[in-house]
């Protein structure tokens, strides 16, 4: 799997999980979130050569098409596969609120 | 939706469905498929600017992060959303076989 266990241990130009820390205030302008101040969001990036973690029949076909037609602009792209939620604490006036935000952290990637 | 109805009627640099006809023999080297000779596979391509058809909370966050940090390499990517199968006819000796290949045709796209 193109997850932290594999991608963070190997120097990989191909599609892989990349580390990305997002500071809510600095990077997004969200000043109202009390905790956490930021989080490891991660992201997916890298080339999708022939059959590198292809997600669907179409991405396999596209990857083969690209190998045979290298001048073509049609190629699979490296995107998130598994995502996890993030729990935040914020205040409505003096009242603390806890919210679970879905699909905020990328855990693994795929070529799609 | 970033489908044929929208994308094939509008000149769109952003993420959209693009027409792609694949000839099985010429483009993939698959000589054994009897019918069809090829098919409209289509593919997804184009930029994923701020909130352009964002797929998940993470892609929204990444898109906003990219707006505020334009030098960053972390940005969403244009990939397939809805896929459809393709039915093919081939022969095992003299015996005709009909097979439905799943996820072969891209019908719409998203930024993920």
């Amino acid at each position: 799997a193109l997850d932290a266990a594999y991608c963070f241990r190997n120097v990989q130009d191909n599609c892989c999980l990349r580390p990305l820390y997002i500071d809510f205030k600095r990077d997004l302008g969200w000043k109202w979130i009390h905790e956490p101040k930021g989080y490891n969001a991660n992201f997916c990036a890298g080339a999708c050569p022939y059959l590198w973690s292809s997600d669907t029949q179409h991405s396999r076909v596209l990857s083969l098409y690209n190998t045979i037609n290298p001048e073509a602009s049609a190629s699979p792209c490296c995107v998130s596969q598994d995502l996890e939620p993030l729990t935040i604490l914020y205040y409505i006036g003096k009242t603390p609120k806890i919210e679970q935000l879905s699909n905020m952290i990328v855990k693994s990637c795929k070529c799609s | 939706a970033l489908d044929a109805a929208y994308c094939f009627r509008n000149v769109q640099d952003n993420c959209c469905l693009r027409p792609l006809y694949i000839d099985f023999k010429r483009d993939l080297g698959w000589k054994w498929i009897h019918e069809p000779k090829g098919y409209n596979a289509n593919f997804c391509a184009g930029a994923c600017p701020y909130l352009w058809s964002s797929d998940t909370q993470h892609s929204r966050v990444l898109s906003l992060y990219n707006t505020i940090n334009p030098e960053a390499s972390a940005s969403p990517c244009c990939v397939s959303q809805d896929l459809e199968p393709l039915t093919i006819l081939y022969y095992i000796g003299k015996t005709p076989k009909i097979e439905q290949l799943s996820n072969m045709i891209v019908k719409s796209c998203k930024c993920s």
């Epitope: 000043k31 609120k97 | 909130l51 906003l64």
Partner: antibody, heavy 121, light 107 residues
Framework: EVQLVQSGAEVKKPGASVKVSCKTS????????MNWVRQAPGAGLDWMGQ????????NYNEMFEGRVTLTADTSTSTAYMELSSLRAGDIAVYYC??????????????WGQGTLVTVSS | DIVMTQTPPSLSVSPRETASISCRAS??????????MHWYLQKPGQSPQLLIY???NLESGVSDRFSGSGSGTDFTLRISRVEANDTGVYYC?????????FGQGTK
């Protein structure tokens, strides 16, 4: 230039629902909370609730709880307020107003032009 | 809920004079070193506009003839060298407690 442009005046029958839109431009829609405030004829301001468009998180004033629904469409940077079970007491100008940004519950620095909702049989 | 009471309900001021409006909260609106009190002006036929943020901070683009002061439960908006263009209804607003609430207005 930050702009909040609201939909036009509405006339509704008692018991019906109304949906008011607030199209924004000139700022990053998913960075700020959007508030809704109403003002009955010749009266003061009543805060109805708020939404954080990035996630659709909402916070309602209990006075309106159950009758008001706030939504947001991030693809068009538009916020919506729907009020159901309309009665004569709901005749008012409804405003969308952007939160200042430092807190979830905050002052409001930009306001829409207002939408007059009339309830009449 | 925090109730905001403004005085006076209405006020008539001659040009170039100073006007003062008071706002009293039913309980303290101070938290974390800030006073969560703001002031707005609603001119006739217009939407409200923010004048003062966090009790005493002048909003960008607002004339420095407007000033705010106070803490805890008692707050004051002062308008010096009053102009005809200052005509309207002034509202105070707290956001220290949910639900956010406004004063009834001073005309």
């Amino acid at each position: 230039e930050v702009q909040l442009v609201q939909s036009g005046a509405e006339v509704k029958k008692p018991g019906a629902s109304v949906k008011v839109s607030c199209k924004t431009s000139g700022y990053t829609f998913i960075t700020y909370w959007m508030n809704w405030v109403r003002q009955a004829p010749g009266a003061g301001l009543d805060w109805m609730g708020q939404i954080f468009p990035a996630w659709g998180m909402t916070n309602y004033n209990e006075m309106f709880e159950g009758r008001v629904t706030l939504t947001a469409d991030t693809s068009t940077s538009t916020a919506y307020m729907e009020l159901s079970s309309l009665r004569a007491g709901d005749i008012a100008v409804y405003y969308c107003a952007r939160g200042y940004g430092n807190y979830a519950l905050d002052a409001m620095d930009y306001w829409g032009q207002g939408t007059l909702v009339t309830v009449s049989s | 809920d925090i109730v905001m009471t403004q005085t006076p309900p209405s006020l008539s001021v001659s040009p170039r004079e100073t006007a003062s409006i008071s706002c009293r909260a039913s309980e303290s609106v101070d938290s974390y070193g800030n006073s969560f009190m703001h002031w707005y002006l609603q001119k006739p036929g217009q939407s409200p506009q923010l004048l003062i943020y966090l009790a005493s901070n002048l909003e960008s683009g607002v004339s420095d003839r407007f000033s705010g002061s106070g803490s805890g439960t008692d707050f004051t908006l002062r308008i010096s060298r009053v102009e005809a263009n200052d005509t309207g209804v002034y509202y105070c607003q707290q956001n220290d407690e949910d639900p956010l609430s406004f004063g009834q207005g001073t005309k």
